[in-house]
């Protein structure tokens, strides 16, 4: 039985489609292609005589069609108006003609989408971010990618407006990264340039190293005190030190050479992040003994958290 196969079935506007004829009868002497589901002289695209290899255009010929000796019809630079049914009539020597109908669907060529955001530098646990994939295209599927992966399942991620809008509720630092949207129809797909989400966070409660363990590790007189403060923060936090409440330097590392019992007291590291508006601190008590006895860094370190 004569059949028509469209390759591809879903075609992007501007591309080409090939209508392939299968199971052609042996005694064929010519072909005619028609636009639509029936044989109608006004809808004739092209006729073909096998003996002379002569193609004759009909009223529905647009100049974009090519017929081949195997009855296949190539249509180039397709438009949405080309969507629909196409009928092949095979003319046989016994004059008992055979007909078969095929179809294809033309979809609009998709534009390259772009992402707009209401906030590309949100603050952790405070801000929500809405990404919108533009433009709006009818009969189109919208997909989102984060760092090259499909969207993770999370109650904080919401899709709305036909998936055109991705909302991150109460952003977390792990949400930082590269966001892309993709628009798809059955014929084609197009992906946006990535947009970077920079999540501002911290400063977390700092830690002071070396972490003295066990708690009674000794600071002997004459030793060097080298305390390093670290806090997770974006942007990097501003560090500052206070010894017994007196402001010191603004470096990450506090170094005091050849400490003595005069250096006893509370050592506080303060961290601040102007972008989040948050501060934090940690305080450690240090006891320096004269050579021979061994107190140390107080185990009762306490920290303060400010918003």
């Amino acid at each position: 039985k004569l059949t028509i196969e469209s390759t591809p079935f879903n075609v992007a506007e501007g591309k080409e489609v090939l209508l392939l004829a299968h199971n052609l009868p042996q005694n064929r002497i010519g072909y005619s292609w028609y636009k639509g589901e029936r044989v109608d002289g006004n809808s004739l695209i092209v006729g073909y005589v096998i003996g002379t290899q002569q193609a004759t255009p009909g009223p529905a010929y647009s100049g974009r069609e090519t017929i081949y000796p195997n009855a296949s019809l190539l249509i180039q630079n397709v438009t949405q108006n080309d969507t629909g049914f196409y009928t092949l009539q095979v003319i046989k020597s016994d004059l008992v003609n055979e007909e078969a109908t095929g179809q294809f669907h033309v979809y609009p060529e998709l534009p390259k989408p772009s992402i707009s955001s209401n906030n590309s530098n949100p603050v952790e646990d405070k801000d929500a971010v809405a990404f919108t994939c533009e433009p709006e295209v009818q009969n189109t599927t919208y997909l989102w990618w984060v760092n090259g992966q499909s969207l993770p399942v999370s109650p904080r991620l919401q899709l709305s407006n036909g998936n055109m809008t991705l909302t991150l509720l109460s952003v977390k630092r792990n949400d930082a990264g590269s966001y892309e949207c993709e628009i798809q129809n059955p014929a084609s797909a197009n992906r946006s340039d990535p947009v970077t989400l920079n999540v501002l966070y911290g400063p977390d409660v700092p830690t002071i190293s070396p972490i003295i363990s066990p708690p009674d590790s000794s600071y002997l007189s004459g030793a060097n005190l080298n305390l390093s403060c670290h806090s997770a923060s974006n942007p990097s936090p501003q560090y500052s030190w206070r010894i017994n409440g007196i402001p010191q330097q603004h470096t990450q590392v506090l170094f005091i050479a050849k400490i003595t019992p005069n250096n006893n007291g509370t050592y506080a590291c303060f961290v601040s992040n102007l972008a989040t508006g948050r501060n934090n601190s940690i305080v450690k008590s240090i006891t320096v003994s004269a050579s021979g006895t061994s107190p140390g860094l107080s185990a009762g370190a306490h920290h303060h958290h400010h918003h």
Partner: antibody, heavy 120, light 107 residues
Framework: QVQLQQSGAELAKSGASVKMSCKAS????????LHWVKQRPGQGLEWIGY????????NYSQKFKDKATLTADKSSSTAYMQLSSLTSEDSAVYYC?????????????WGQGTSVTVSS | DIQMTQSPASLSASVGETVTITCRAS??????LAWYQQKQGKSPQLLVF???NLVEGVPSRFSGSGSGTQFSLKINSLQPEDFGSYYC?????????FGGGTKLEIK
């Protein structure tokens, strides 16, 4: 007290290189990052880059990536900047300056500047 | 890179007057802004950091304000030693960039 002492004025030919120094005193050299800033006669200030003297890590402005090379010698508490392939555009005063703290702080102490004149 | 736009480029004022210099950042720099004073033939001197923190030893007639993208430096009751050039600079990550400068002259 904190001081940054820069080397003397340089007169160099077009296409040549110069290396200037910045000797730090009055603080722990490895605890603070050192920046370099350019100022052309009668013009504003241009940030070149910085070096972390403790690790040798450097960060350059895109404009100066192929022009400047920053190094530091911990043993002498001295930072250096070499400028290569000199042109008349490089004629300027170059300052070294200490960052007030680590991360996102401004520059609190500046050297007196090294004047570089490039002649053809 | 973040662009810093300073205005005015030059300013004439008399001793005792109050003047304000403004600085605009091309994007949000939160409060990471510094002000410097530079006198002819000298190195710049830090006056203000974190937009409003006065450096120790800087007279209280200087004050900084602003956040986000708009900042200003106010000098109350100008003194003869205040004349010179002033620069703003963001210190929100690298590359650091400076404003074009404001030349404050005696009227």
């Amino acid at each position: 007290q904190v001081q940054l002492q820069q080397s003397g004025a340089e007169l160099a030919k077009s296409g040549a290189s110069v290396k200037m120094s910045c000797k730090a005193s009055g603080y722990i050299f490895t605890s603070y990052w050192l920046h370099w800033v350019k100022q052309r006669p009668g013009q504003g200030l241009e940030w070149i880059g910085y070096i972390n003297p403790n690790t040798g890590y450097t960060n350059y402005s895109q404009k100066f990536k192929d022009k400047a090379t920053l190094t530091a010698d911990k043993s002498s508490s001295t930072a250096y900047m070499q400028l290569s392939s000199l042109t008349s555009e490089d004629s300027a005063v170059y300052y070294c300056a200490r960052e007030y703290g680590n991360y996102n702080y401004p520059l609190d102490y500046w050297g007196q500047g090294t004047s570089v004149t490039v002649s053809s | 890179d973040i662009q810093m736009t300073q205005s005015p480029a030059s300013l004439s004022a008399s001793v005792g007057e109050t003047v304000t210099i403004t600085c605009r950042a091309s994007e949000n720099i939160y409060g990471y802004l510094a002000w410097y004073q530079q006198k002819q033939g000298k190195s710049p001197q830090l006056l203000v950091f974190n937009a409003k923190n006065l450096v120790e030893g800087v007279p209280s007639r200087f004050s900084g304000s602003g956040s986000g993208t708009q900042f200003s430096l106010k000098i109350n009751s100008l003194q003869p030693e205040d004349f010179g050039s002033y620069y703003c600079q963001h210190h929100y990550g690298t590359p650091y960039t400076f404003g074009g400068g404001t030349k404050l002259e005696i009227k």
